[in-house]
Amino acid sequence: EEELQVIQPDKSVLVAAGETATLRCTATSLIPVGPIQWFRGAGPGRELIYNQKEGHFPRVTTVSDLTKRNNMDFSIRIGNITPADAGTYYCVKFRKGSPDDVEFKSGAGTELSVRAKPSAPVVSGPAARATPQHTVSFTCESHGFSPRDITLKWFKNGNELSDFQTNVDPVGESVSYSIHSTAKVVLTREDVHSQVICEVAHVTLQGDPLRGTANLSETIRVPPTLEVTQQPVRAENQVNVTCQVRKFYPQRLQLTWLENGNVSRTETASTVTENKDGTYNWMSWLLVNVSAHRDDVKLTCQVEHDGQPAVSKSHDLKVSAHPKEQGSNTAAENTGSNERNIYHHHHHH
């Protein structure tokens, strides 16, 4: 009679994480008498997966009833597979011996590969806000996938980005892998409503990729533009001076009126109007009683936006001239004077 052979018909088996792996093994003879054991790996460090004779192996079930006398099918099923189960599995026949059974013949081995889905990509942006024209970096990370092959893409405003660097770790063989990518994005004034998207495509995902997003509204700071203008009002001795604060983001803004360099009033932007591009506009105004002034008045609108250094715009109010003939708008620095004869009001649009 021919000597017993241990046949593992599958060179490799591919299983999705969470599924059950079937590892097939048959013997060609009932002789010699003795149990079958399954191992992961070969050599002295091999790991016992299943022992027909003894032990408790909760994740392993046999395909056939091994207690039947004429059974030659030693296939097993391993449940709830994880990437850590990847490796080469050997079906090994032992000959009954005393005191211990002796290894008789091993199958050629079946390589178990585990396909595991990547985790949802997490996109993070810079810690501090940046202004338009600046380049900022976004990172994207996804973990726990197998096999190693993966595709990562970046998008912004309907377009694919090209300025990014991606690494998949570890470089060598591993049960699962991680991907890390850094993309560089140049901010524009229109980016308040923009999103940066990181997309990960992997064989396990098939029809739908995974995406992570970051809103540029959390990254961008659009500084305001200021315009100070004066309009005469009905009463001949009163002038309405307005400070238009335009196209700023985020909303956090404090405005201070100065009269000849002295603080007249400070207010915080509350009821703002939103532009189509997501930026805000705000207006504050002062009612100036010209007759209360002997000299010219320098009115300054000073704005502190989102904790940044203040920007200002000044307007020279010529008290000698008729209010309807005024209209000087300069960006001169504040000058000192302690005249304080302005009746002020403010108004929000």
Partner: antibody
Framework: QIQLVQSGPELKKPGETVKISCKAS????????MHWVKQAPGKGLKWMGW????????TYAEDFKGRFAFFLETSASTAYLQINNVKNEDTATYFC?????????????WGQGTSVIVSS | DIQMTQSSSSFSVSLGDRVTITCKAS??????LAWYQQKPGNAPRLLIS???SLETGVPSRFSGSGSGKDYTLSITSLQTEDVATYYC?????????FGGGTKLEIK
């Protein structure tokens, strides 16, 4: 070459069940998604959903949740669309289509279509 | 859901004409747009993927363009075999959605 071959036409009465098969060949079946698309007579194409051929997960479009089910017989490289409790409005041609992955999730290969007529 | 709008449901054209079919998405689809050709009684055939990439075996008279929300399929010189219904489809998001189709008919 890559082929998707669908089962033949079906004539059903309202309330019955219909099962359409789509046999794939020429590629590794479990590497690509399988989509299903409905086309009512004289109408446009309507995406029904897709099946992850590796994990077995199904995704259904809103209009196809409930009576519709996608199945697989991986060993035979075959996908199935089952419609339970068929209604007159299910009269249509149903297509299976392979979906790519990587950077291209497009439906690149299509079955020839299976005509389903529901009539009492 | 992303709506796909093909503004013309049918076109009467002459052989040799240049034909342009437009497709508008209700939001950005990041060039994840496919064009299909369907002849009566047949399955749809993929012509273009990724908004601009011509599939193998598709004649070079077909081309795709566009980005963001607006996309176009062009046929430079219409041939008899091009008489069909053309569908755009976005595959940026689930549910995948098709345009209503544009039927080309010979004058």
């Amino acid at each position: 070459q890559i082929q998707l071959v669908q089962s033949g036409p079906e004539l059903k009465k309202p309330g019955e069940t219909v099962k359409i098969s789509c046999k794939a060949s020429g590629y590794t079946f479990t590497d690509y998604a399988m989509h299903w698309v409905k086309q009512a007579p004289g109408k446009g194409l309507k995406w029904m959903g897709w099946k992850n051929t590796e994990t077995g997960e199904s995704t259904y479009a809103e209009d196809f949740k409930g009576r519709f089910a996608f199945f697989l017989e991986t060993s035979a490289s075959t996908a199935y669309l089952q419609i339970n409790n068929v209604k007159n409005e299910d009269t249509a041609t149903y297509f299976c289509a392979r979906g790519g992955y990587g950077s291209n999730y497009v439906m690149d290969y299509w079955g020839q279509g299976t005509s389903v007529i529901v009539s009492s | 859901d992303i709506q796909m709008t093909q503004s013309s449901s049918s076109f009467s054209v002459s052989l040799g004409d240049r034909v342009t079919i437009t497709c508008k998405a209700s939001e950005d689809i990041y060039n994840r747009l496919a064009w299909y050709q369907q002849k009566p009684g047949n399955a749809p055939r993929l012509l273009i993927s990724g908004a601009t990439s011509l599939e193998t075996g598709v004649p070079s008279r077909f081309s795709g363009s566009g980005s963001g929300k607006d996309y176009t399929l062009s046929i430079t010189s219409l041939q008899t075999e091009d008489v069909a219904t053309y569908y755009c489809q976005q595959y940026w998001n689930s549910p995948r959605t098709f345009g209503g189709g544009t039927k080309l008919e010979i004058k």
